[in-house]
Every structure is written in C-alpha cells, then in structure tokens.
Amino acid sequence: FERTRSLQDPCSNCPAGTFCDNNRNQICSPCPPNSFSSAGGQRTCDICRQCKGVFRTRKECSSTSNAECDCTPGFHCLGAGCSMCEQDCKQGQELTKKGCKDCCFGTFNDQKRGICRPWTNCSLDGKSVLVNGTKERDVVCGPSPADLSPGASSVTPPAPAREPGHSPQ
C-alpha cells in the first residue's frame, strides 16, 4: 500500500525539513531559511515564529521544528506555546488591570502570577488550622480538633516542591 501511495503521490516521499516543490516537478526541496516543516509530505514550509520584544528565544527554529519563545525576566508565559507574556507580581500580590495589587486580608498568592485566593477554611473539610495563613501562604490544615490531644505535636509539613503555576505549559 505504501508503495502504491508513493507512486500516486510523489510528495509523500518528502521528509520533514523539506517541501514538495510544484515549481520543480514535485521534487523535495529543503525548507528556505526561517521556515520549517515538522512532518513529511508537506507542500509548503511554515514560517518560523520570531521571538521579539518581551519574548525571548527558548529554542531556535530548525528546518524540522518551530522556534519556541519564553518571556524576558519580570514576565511569565500565558497561553498555549507561550502566546502571551504577562507581567510578574510579587508573592502576596495579584495582577489586576491596574497593575500589581496586594492581596486583601484572608487571601494569599504564593506565586508571581495568578490571583489572590481565599485561605482554605479547614473546618469545612473537618480539620483544624495548624499554621495561620499570610498574604504569601495558605493556611496549613491539620487533623480535626478532636484528633488533637494534649501533647500531640503540630508540625508544619514541608512546602510542596511545586505549586500550581510553576510547571511549564
């Protein structure tokens, strides 16, 4: 079947990094500079993404893969493939349309991005507060009040290795 298909469509033989050039009798031609084709059998090459301004190049474009951008210091990526760069704020702040704003009492943000979130209400999950919340940290919930007998230790667990928002998109 593959042989029949390639006899019918010579373009299917063109590998990634090339395109099927109709102007040259459907010969496989290399992608021109600043363009790429990530799959075989393509009739055109795609223009490479250019990382300009607040974007910076994380991975250069090659003949078989597009460039990848991230953001300059003080900004972070948003959207699929880092389609936007958004201003960082400090922990304990959130970005509003008017700029960075401190979290109100009872809310926190442990990242340089995202919103100020209400502290977890431990009692709603049948637990008690082990460590109070701050603008930068959520409360730490522990066992239910009934489980805490005199002399029971209240040890703050280690912070998670990565909070939501810190993983690459």
Partner: antibody, heavy 120, light 106 residues
Framework: QMQLVQSGAEVKKPGASVKVSCKAS????????MHWVRQAPGQGLEWMGW????????NYAQKFQGRVTITRDTSASTAYMELSSLRSEDTAVYYC?????????????WGQGTLVTVSS | SYELTQPPSVSVAPGKTARITCGGN??????VHWYQQKPGQAPVLVIY???DRPSGIPERFSGSNSGNTATLTISRVEAGDEADYYC?????????FGGGTQLTVL
C-alpha cells in the same frame, strides 16, 4: 494530549452521598488547580469549588459549603468531588475542569461530565 | 454576590455577525472568559482574558470588555456555531458564570 476522564453515571437516593472522580493525563497534575462545575438539566453552569493539587487546599462556593468535599490523590493524578445529603435538585451533570493561568481565572480543559441522578 | 447577565437567546443568519453580551457591575475591571457548549458536550473555552483565543479556535471569534458590558463577537457565523455561550469571571472568592445565551443560526 491533555485530558480529564471522569467516572461513570450514578443513580442515588435522596439523603445519600456521591463521589465522582476525575483522572488527569497529558500534563503535570500538580501544576494546575482543579475545579468542579455542575449543570442541572436545561440549566446553566454552576461553580462548586476547587482543590490545590499540591497542598490539598480547597475553596467552595458558599451554596455548597458543608455538603461538598473536594480532594485529590496526587499519586493517581486524580481529583474527587463528594456531595452529601443529596436531594432531587442535585440531579445534574458534574464536570471537573482544569484552571488556566494568570489574570482572572479561566477553565481551559474540561472532563466529559458525569451524570448524577437523585431519585427515590 | 456578583451577578452576570446574558440575553437568553440570540438569532443570526449564516454569514452574518452575532454579538452576545455579558453585563456586570464594572465588569471592565475584570477578566472575562467565554465558553461554547453544544448539546450533550462539555463546555469549550473560546475566549480568555477578554479577547484572547486558545489555539484551535477560529479567528472569527473575538471578545471585548469595557465599562459594564463584555461582548463575544462571532463573525461570518456558520451553522456549526449554534450552541450555548457562557461568560465567566472571578470575583474575590468565587467563579461566577452568566446564565448563558442560546445562539440560533437561522
């Protein structure tokens, strides 16, 4: 690709509890808050709450406080929503949805939904 | 608590432009997200942060937000755009959805 797969349909009696699961794949489970949203037949979307997949911290809509518990199992990349003291008005499709990033709060990946029917 | 108001239904002829509004007190200060939901399916994010499109969403979908009204605009409407559309914001401690608008393509 990024996917949220929910547990199957449930039929419950009034007063009972239901626990719906939501298994994440194709992305770092620990990197994104997980939300639960429900939709009664012929009605709009109603937010129930979220869980922080790392700390287990939660936030619930006032309407559901005391009746809903959202948890997670990071080793299984799975979030759970348990609703207790069920009544007929809780008959709905329950969705889990992953939170995106940044200014505001968008839900960029949704599960297929789980129909919970409450009937005597 | 914060409320979002949408018209229950909007009708439009194929190829024309549909505008779906979402009203809320000073909504222009918030980030608005829009979802499309077809019968029997889960919602799909079509606009986020007022006017940005996720990958895979056609350029025909656009959004704007100022004052007390956010608007989802669908240009060159197609039969496949027929669905319910919901706006959504974050307000201090909860996620708030509009009541939804049923878009009918005539």
């Amino acid at each position: 690709q990024m996917q949220l797969v929910q547990s199957g349909a449930e039929v419950k009696k009034p007063g009972a509890s239901v626990k719906v699961s939501c298994k994440a794949s194709g992305y770092s489970f620990g990197g994104y808050y997980m939300h639960w949203v429900r939709q009664a037949p012929g009605q709009g979307l109603e937010w129930m709450g979220w869980v922080n997949p790392n700390s287990g911290g939660t936030n619930y809509a006032q309407k559901f406080q005391g009746r809903v518990t959202i948890t997670r199992d990071t080793s299984a990349s799975t979030a759970y929503m348990e609703l207790s003291s069920l009544r007929s008005e809780d008959t709905a499709v329950y969705y889990c949805a992953r939170e995106g990033y940044g200014l505001g709060l968008d839900l960029d990946v949704w599960g297929q939904g789980t129909l919970v029917t409450v009937s005597s | 608590s914060y409320e979002l108001t949408q018209p229950p239904s909007v009708s439009v002829a194929p190829g024309k432009t549909a505008r779906i509004t979402c009203g809320g007190n000073n909504i222009g200060s918030k980030s608005v997200h829009w979802y499309q939901q077809k019968p029997g399916q889960a919602p799909v994010l079509v606009i986020y942060y007022d006017s940005d499109r996720p990958s895979g969403i056609p350029e025909r979908f656009s959004g704007s937000n100022s004052g007390n009204t956010a608007t989802l605009t669908i240009s060159r409407v197609e039969a496949g755009d027929e669905a319910d559309y919901y706006c959504q914001v974050w307000d201090s401690s909860s996620v708030v959805f509009g009541g939804g608008t049923q878009l009918t393509v005539l």
